[in-house]
Interface confidence: medium
Amino acid sequence: HNTTVFQGVAGQSLQVSCPYDSMKHWGRRKAWCRQLGEKGPCQRVVSTHNLWLLSFLRRWNGSTAITDDTLGGTLTITLRNLQPHDAGLYQCQSLHGSEADTLRKVLVEVLADPLDHRDAGDLWFPGESESFEDAHVEHSISRSLLEGEIPFPPTS
């Protein structure tokens, strides 16, 4: 898998899209996970609704949301109030039993808010470190939550 780079600005929302073959992955739940190391595990951040037919419902874990357009074949992840430590390598996954197929590898890059006059030295961001040949950059700054959309409280 090539890796797609999504760039967002700290404090704003970032939408990550993962297209897939809707027929091939029919009936499968999806997940968003964070790669912890080169050969380490991909730690689950959030997954779609337990009932596949309700995958269109947005599910939250902290500031991260996931929703799945199962007909159109697009998994969408929203990182709300993007923070420097949200940067890193992630995967969109299609789940079947105890197995998971990688739909897309995603590198999230967090840029300092140019309008934020706090000292950037007080911010910390993590980084990216695997060899990603032909990485594709998508500047994807998404809108904020719609009024009435209430995320689950953050998890520790």
């Epitope: 080169e38 430590h85 999230v108 840029l111 300092a112 910390w124 993590p126 980084g127």
Partner: antibody
Framework: EVQLLESGGGLVQPGGSLRLSCAAS????????MAWVRQAPGKGLEWVSS????????YYADSVKGRFTISRDNSKNTLYLQMNSLRAEDTAVYYC????????????WGQGTLVTVSS | DIQMTQSPSSLSASVGDRVTITCKAS??????LAWYQQKPGKAPKLLIY???NRFTGVPSRFSGSGSGTDFTLTISSLQPEDFATYYC?????????FGQGTKLEIK
Amino acid sequence: EVQLLESGGGLVQPGGSLRLSCAASGFTFSNYYMAWVRQAPGKGLEWVSSLTNSGGSTYYADSVKGRFTISRDNSKNTLYLQMNSLRAEDTAVYYCAKEWAGSGYFDYWGQGTLVTVSS
Amino acid sequence: DIQMTQSPSSLSASVGDRVTITCKASQNVGNNLAWYQQKPGKAPKLLIYYTSNRFTGVPSRFSGSGSGTDFTLTISSLQPEDFATYYCQRIYNSPWTFGQGTKLEIK
């Protein structure tokens, strides 16, 4: 094989300037966040500065803020650290390092270059 | 800022010994901890990330454990090449903080 090779260290007087370079090979440099970490003689490790893989954002430790500038040239696979207004307490071995995705730990380091600030 | 305190600062042991180095955080850092090994005149090398995951090529005699504020690096059976200085590091969240180091010497 990942290789990071620092250069540019040396003896400089207080108030002087120095530019460190780090030549990277063995990986796709433009896809990596990079950092400088230093170690004063006989002391522990201290993070100095970092920047995103595109170079779009830079970050500095309080101790060097306003004096040091980190940059990169992805076409040359090279990381830089411009050090101005140097002080005696900046004397250290400076390591170029890359970090694993989104985690803040450094998986590969250069061999280091010694910067000595003394009159 | 969160402080990382290692103990002991120095330690003498023999080849074959089981050695434990501890790292204490001044606040809860979850499992966000890494360990490095550094030999004199050399760059640090990553050993363990996220408390217990061994980095590529690190021998199985090295293991990490702990969570919250108390962490441990264990070397199950010391080898001659293990005599070095070991550092813990808080990772993932700011600021990046290293412990002061533990020097492991031959008894």
